[in-house]
C-alpha cells in the first residue's frame, strides 16, 4: 500500500480467483482513543470500532472512502483505491491500446522539432469519474526536469456504439539541447483513476524518434513555358528547428491522379523545389522528413494541378 | 582537413560522406517493426558509446566559435564505431549477409575519420569496451543496439558538416 495523495492510498492486489488479498490497517487521525466507529462510503453500517480498523482488501467492494467518527462527528477519512495485477501484469483497463506503432501503446507522443517540446495523447471510452496526473523527466535514475502543462480533452469521436475521448498534454524539457545526441530517454508517466481503480502508464522515447515535422508551407506551382512541366516550390514549416542549414529536411513530391488507382509519380529531393509533369485533374503533394534521421514523415501539403 | 594547426576540414567532402553514412546506417538497420531495443536492458552496452553532448560545441554557435572541439568529438566517435563494426560483434556468428551494408558502413566510418585527421596527427581516442557476447542471439541484439546508436550519432555529425559546408566553408 502506498499514498497517492493526502489520505488517498493505493492497494496493490494480485488478482485471481480466491486470492487472499492484502491486509490493510487504517488509523484514525485523532488524539481521541475511545468511542470511535468506522463506516464505508455513504453507508451508516458500523464496520468496527477503535482507533484502528483492520480490513482484508480482496475486491472493489472493499475499496472506497473509510470514515472514522465519534459521536456523530467526522474525525478523518482514508480513500482506498485498487491497482490490479493479473498474471504478473498490471491492469490496463482505463486507457485504450492505440496499437501504433506497436501493440500495448497507450501513450503516443510526437514532437514538431528538436526544441524539447512534445505532445502526448491517450484515448479512453470512459467519460465520468476519471482523473489523471502526468509527470515527465529525462532519464529515471538521475532525472532531469521536464515540465508538463494541463492534460485536456482534445477530441471526442463516435466509434460505433462507443464514444471515444482523447486527452492530450504538452511538455517541455527544462534545459533542452536541440543539437546534442540524446543518450537518456524522456520518460512520461500518466496515472489514471476511474472510480476506485488505479492504473499507471509509461512511455519512454528519444525526441529524435518521435519527430514529425509539420507539412511544408507555401506550396506553389509555376508552369514552365511550352511544356506540361511545372516547377513546384515550397518552404520549411515555421515550427521546424532553425537554422535550416543545420536542421535540414528532405522532401517527397508526389503527383496523384483523381483516382486512387492511378500510378503515383514520386520524386525525393533535399531542395525546396522540383520540376514535375502535371497531369489534368491531378494534384501535387509534398511532405517532409528529417534529412539525417528516419523519423516520421509529415502530413502532405497539397495543391491541385489546374 | 582538420590538421594539427586547427584549420578547417574539407566541409563539403565531409558533408557528402556523412550523409552517405546516414543512409548506410539506416539501410543496415531499418526500423524493424519499431523494435524497441531500450526495453532489453541496454545500459551496460550502449551507455559506453561516445555521445555528442551539449557542451561539445556541435551546435551552430559552437561551430562558429571553434569547430575543433566538435570535430574532435566526432572523430572519437567515428573511430569508436569503426572499431565496433570491425569487432567480433559483427564478424562473428551469425554471419552478415554478403550484400550487408555493414561493410560499406565500416569503410565509410574509416574514410570520414581519415578526412578529419590525416596520418601523423593524433587526437585522443576513446577505449572501446570489451564487449564479447557469447551467444549468437546476444550478438544480434548488440548489433541492433549499436546500429541504432550509430544512426543517432551520424545524424548529428551530418548536421554539423551540412551546416559547416553551408556557412563555414572558405
Amino acid at each position: 500500500i502506498w499514498e497517492l495523495k493526502k489520505d488517498v492510498y493505493v492497494v496493490e492486489l494480485d488478482w485471481y480467483p480466491d486470492a487472499p488479498g492484502e491486509m490493510v490497517v487504517l488509523t484514525c487521525d485523532t488524539p481521541e482513543e475511545d468511542g470511535i466507529t468506522w463506516t464505508l462510503d455513504q453507508s451508516s453500517e458500523v464496520l468496527g470500532s477503535g482507533k484502528t480498523l483492520t480490513i482484508q482488501v480482496k475486491e472493489f467492494g472493499d475499496a472506497g472512502q473509510y470514515t472514522c467518527h465519534k459521536g456523530g462527528e467526522v474525525l478523518s477519512h482514508s480513500l482506498l483505491l485498487l491497482h490490479k495485477k493479473e498474471d504478473g501484469i498490471w491492469s490496463t483497463d482505463i486507457l485504450k491500446d492505440q496499437k501504433e506503432p506497436k501493440n500495448k501503446t497507450f501513450l503516443r507522443c510526437e514532437a514538431k522539432n528538436y526544441s524539447g517540446r512534445f505532445t502526448c495523447w491517450w484515448l479512453t471510452t470512459i467519460s465520468t469519474d476519471l482523473t489523471f496526473s502526468v509527470k515527465s523527466s529525462r532519464g529515471s535514475s538521475d532525472p532531469q526536469g521536464v515540465t508538463c502543462g494541463a492534460a485536456t480533452l482534445s477530441a471526442e469521436r463516435v466509434r460505433g456504439d462507443n464514444k471515444e475521448y482523447e486527452y492530450s498534454v504538452e511538455c517541455q524539457e527544462d534545459s533542452a539541447c536541440p543539437a546534442a545526441e540524446e543518450s537518456l530517454p524522456i520518460e512520461v508517466m500518466v496515472d489514471a483513476v476511474h472510480k476506485l481503480k488505479y492504473e499507471n502508464y509509461t512511455s519512454s522515447f528519444f525526441i529524435r524518434d518521435i519527430i514529425k515535422p509539420d507539412p511544408p508551407k507555401n506550396l506553389q506551382l509555376k508552369p514552365l513555358k511550352n511544356s506540361r512541366q511545372v516547377e513546384v516550390s515550397w518552404e520549411y514549416p515555421d515550427t521546424w528547428s532553425t537554422p535550416h542549414s543545420y536542421f535540414s529536411l528532405t522532401f517527397c513530391v508526389q503527383v496523384q491522379g483523381k483516382s486512387k488507382r492511378e500510378k503515383k509519380d514520386r520524386v525525393f529531393t533535399d531542395k525546396t523545389s522540383a520540376t514535375v509533369i502535371c497531369r489534368k485533374n491531378a494534384s501535387i503533394s509534398v511532405r517532409a522528413q528529417d534529412r539525417y534521421y528516419s523519423s516520421s514523415w509529415s502530413e502532405w501539403a497539397s495543391v491541385p494541378c489546374s | 582537413r582538420a590538421v594539427p594547426g586547427g584549420s578547417s576540414p574539407a566541409w563539403t567532402q565531409c558533408q557528402q560522406l556523412s550523409q552517405k553514412l546516414c543512409t548506410l546506417a539506416w539501410s543496415a538497420h531499418p526500423l524493424v517493426g519499431h523494435m524497441d531495443l531500450r526495453e532489453e536492458g541496454d545500459e551496460e552496452t550502449t551507455n559506453d558509446v561516445p555521445h555528442i553532448q551539449c557542451g561539445d560545441g556541435c551546435d551552430p554557435q559552437g561551430l562558429r566559435d571553434n569547430s575543433q572541439f566538435c570535430l574532435q568529438r566526432i572523430h572519437q566517435g567515428l573511430i569508436f564505431y569503426e572499431k565496433l563494426l570491425g569487432s567480433d560483434i559483427f564478424t562473428g556468428e551469425p554471419s552478415l549477409l554478403p550484400d550487408s551494408p555493414v561493410g560499406q558502413l565500416h569503410a565509410s566510418l574509416l574514410g570520414l575519420s581519415q578526412l578529419l585527421q590525416p596520418e601523423g596527427h593524433h587526437w585522443e581516442t576513446q577505449q572501446i569496451p570489451s564487449l564479447s557476447p557469447s551467444q549468437p542471439w546476444q550478438r544480434l541484439l548488440l548489433r541492433f543496439k549499436i546500429l541504432r546508436s550509430l544512426q543517432a550519432f551520424v545524424a548529428v555529425a551530418a548536421r554539423v558538416f551540412a551546416h559547416g559546408a553551408a556557412t563555414l566553408s572558405p
Epitope: 465520468t128 494541463a150 485536456t152 480533452l153 471526442e156 475521448y165 | -
Partner: nanobody, 125 residues
C-alpha cells in the same frame, strides 16, 4: 494562495430555484475538474455534481439528476450550480471543490484538493 468562494445560497421554498457560484482565485484550473458537494447536518459530505475543464463532461448524483445543472466559465474562473425544483432534502451546506488532477472529476471528495468555505441552502416545505 488558492481560494474558492461560494455564493448564491439562501432560503427558498420547495419547488423554487437557486444558482450557486464558485469563484476561484490564486491559480487557473486549466485541465482540472471542479465539483459541488453538500453536507446535511449530521450526515457525511456527499457528491452532487462535477464538470471537466471543457465543460463537455458532467456528472450528477442520482438524487439531483434532471434538476441540477453544473456549468463553468473558464474566462471568469467560475463554476456554477443551477438548482431547480428544490426539495427539503436538498437542505445542506454546499461546497465547491477543485482538483489538482486532470480529467472529468471524481465522486470522492478526497480526490479534490481545494475547497470553498461552503454556502448554506435551506429549502422549506
Amino acid at each position: 494562495e488558492v481560494q474558492l468562494v461560494e455564493s448564491g445560497g439562501g432560503l427558498v421554498q420547495a419547488g423554487g430555484s437557486l444558482r450557486l457560484s464558485c469563484a476561484a482565485s490564486g491559480r487557473t484550473f486549466e485541465g482540472n475538474p471542479m465539483g459541488w458537494f453538500r453536507q446535511a447536518s449530521g450526515k457525511k459530505r456527499e457528491f452532487v455534481a462535477s464538470i471537466d475543464w471543457s465543460g463537455g463532461i458532467t456528472s450528477y448524483a442520482d438524487s439531483v439528476k434532471g434538476r441540477f445543472t453544473i456549468s463553468r466559465d473558464n474566462a471568469k474562473n467560475t463554476v456554477y450550480l443551477q438548482m431547480n425544483s428544490l426539495k427539503p432534502e436538498d437542505t445542506a451546506v454546499y461546497y465547491c471543490a477543485a482538483s489538482a488532477r486532470f480529467g472529468s472529476g471524481s465522486y470522492y471528495d478526497l480526490m479534490y484538493d481545494y475547497w470553498g468555505q461552503g454556502t448554506q441552502v435551506t429549502v422549506s416545505s
